[in-house]
């Protein structure tokens, strides 16, 4: 079972992931981003449910498409190159979701824009941070 120190580490990793996702959202929502309309045409798969750490499997599977869309954005909107940003997120996600490799993601029927996708995972991080004990 997780210890108080491992739970604290999990909280910190979730906060880091939350900040990264918020940074991406702010970057693409930037009024100076001329590629936003184009970026909004890309569709992302949404998790059927996202309440627990194991559901991060669904985020992991969409990181490559996320990187591809971010490559469209002007790099000055982000502190890091999309490849480095997504790599950092991937490391956190892999640690958070654990080694339960047999867990398969199930997706919702409807796809979403990058903004809806990011908002969903931001909500996920916020809710776990507030309820993890």
């Amino acid at each position: 079972a997780p210890t108080s120190s491992s739970t604290k580490k999990t909280q910190l990793q979730l906060e880091h992931l939350l900040l990264d996702l918020q940074m991406i959202l702010n970057g693409i929502n930037n009024y100076k981003n001329p590629k936003l309309t184009r970026m909004l045409t890309f569709k992302f798969y949404m998790p059927k449910k996202a309440t627990e750490l194991k559901h991060l499997q669904c985020l992991e599977e969409e990181l490559k498409p996320l990187e591809e869309v971010l490559n469209l954005a002007q790099s000055k909107n982000f502190h890091l190159r999309p490849r480095d940003l997504i790599s950092n997120i991937n490391v956190i996600v892999l640690e958070l979701k654990g080694s339960e490799t047999t867990f398969m993601c199930e997706y919702a029927d409807e796809t979403a824009t990058i903004v809806e996708f990011l908002n969903r995972w931001i909500t996920f991080c916020q809710s776990i941070i507030s309820t993890l004990t």
Epitope: A1, P2, T51, L53, G98, S127, T131
Partner: antibody
Framework: EVQLVESGGGLVKPGGSLRLSCAAS????????LAWVRQAPGKGLEWVAA???????YSPDTVRGRFTISRDNAKNSLYLQMNSLRAEDTAVYYC???????????WGQGTLVTVSS | DIQMTQSPSSLSASVGDRVSITCKAS??????VGWYQQKPGKAPKALIY???FRYSGVPSRFSGSGSGTDFTLTISSLQPEDFATYFC?????????FGGGTKLEIK
């Protein structure tokens, strides 16, 4: 057949403690998130705590620091340790299975906890 | 926390009637909504998941609909055993929250 059977309820004084148990059968216990949901007399349902398959635990502000959820996969059992009990904790406590991708699909019959002096 | 506002809180109807119960979420919850039936002194029983899918063994007269913030449970033709209290629940995010319940009574 999935079965969840709660036990451990009873009368306790304010400030006291109680430990509830839930014995599970009919499914691969270790693979599921389990939850406790309570219902005060004549009232609605309130989610109290959950524990996932990795034993990470989740609970709302109302019980955090007082209630602790735990599980023993070897015994197919779920527990709720309730400390510093208050009159407003009086309720029927249900154990429920949280399906991986959907709602709370199976519920136990409940156990009544009464907090009164 | 996400609030689930259920209406009506009570409803009188007759056997054979068609009835609908609504639930409104305080924010978008996609289709992460379940419906439960509870009879006096008994545990809740899961009826509907993902807003519109019936659990195995649930009669076809029960149907769910909705997405986003507005959800409906409909019983197409009330049977005597359907008189009970019904609850909606969101499982979009922790903490899970429930509607206040709708008590369905015989007219």
């Amino acid at each position: 057949e999935v079965q969840l059977v709660e036990s451990g309820g009873g009368l306790v004084k304010p400030g006291g403690s109680l430990r509830l148990s839930c014995a599970a059968s009919g499914f691969t216990f270790s693979s599921y998130t389990l939850a406790w949901v309570r219902q005060a007399p004549g009232k609605g349902l309130e989610w109290v705590a959950a524990i996932d398959s990795s034993s990470y635990t989740y609970s709302p502000d109302t019980v955090r620091g007082r209630f602790t959820i735990s599980r023993d996969n070897a015994k197919n059992s779920l527990y709720l340790q309730m400390n510093s009990l208050r009159a407003e904790d009086t309720a029927v406590y249900y154990c429920a299975r949280d399906s991986n991708w959907d709602a709370l699909d199976y519920w136990g019959q409940g156990t009544l906890v009464t907090v009164s002096s | 926390d996400i609030q689930m506002t259920q209406s009506p809180s009570s409803l009188s109807a007759s056997v054979g009637d068609r009835v609908s119960i609504t639930c409104k979420a305080s924010q978008n919850v996609g289709t992460n909504v379940g419906w439960y039936q509870q009879k006096p002194g008994k545990a809740p029983k899961a009826l509907i998941y993902s807003a519109s899918f019936r659990y195995s063994g649930v009669p076809s007269r029960f149907s769910g609909s909705g997405s986003g913030t507005d959800f409906t449970l409909t019983i197409s033709s009330l049977q005597p055993e359907d008189f009970a209290t019904y609850f909606c629940q969101q499982y979009y995010t922790y903490p899970y929250t429930f509607g206040g319940g709708t008590k369905l009574e015989i007219k």
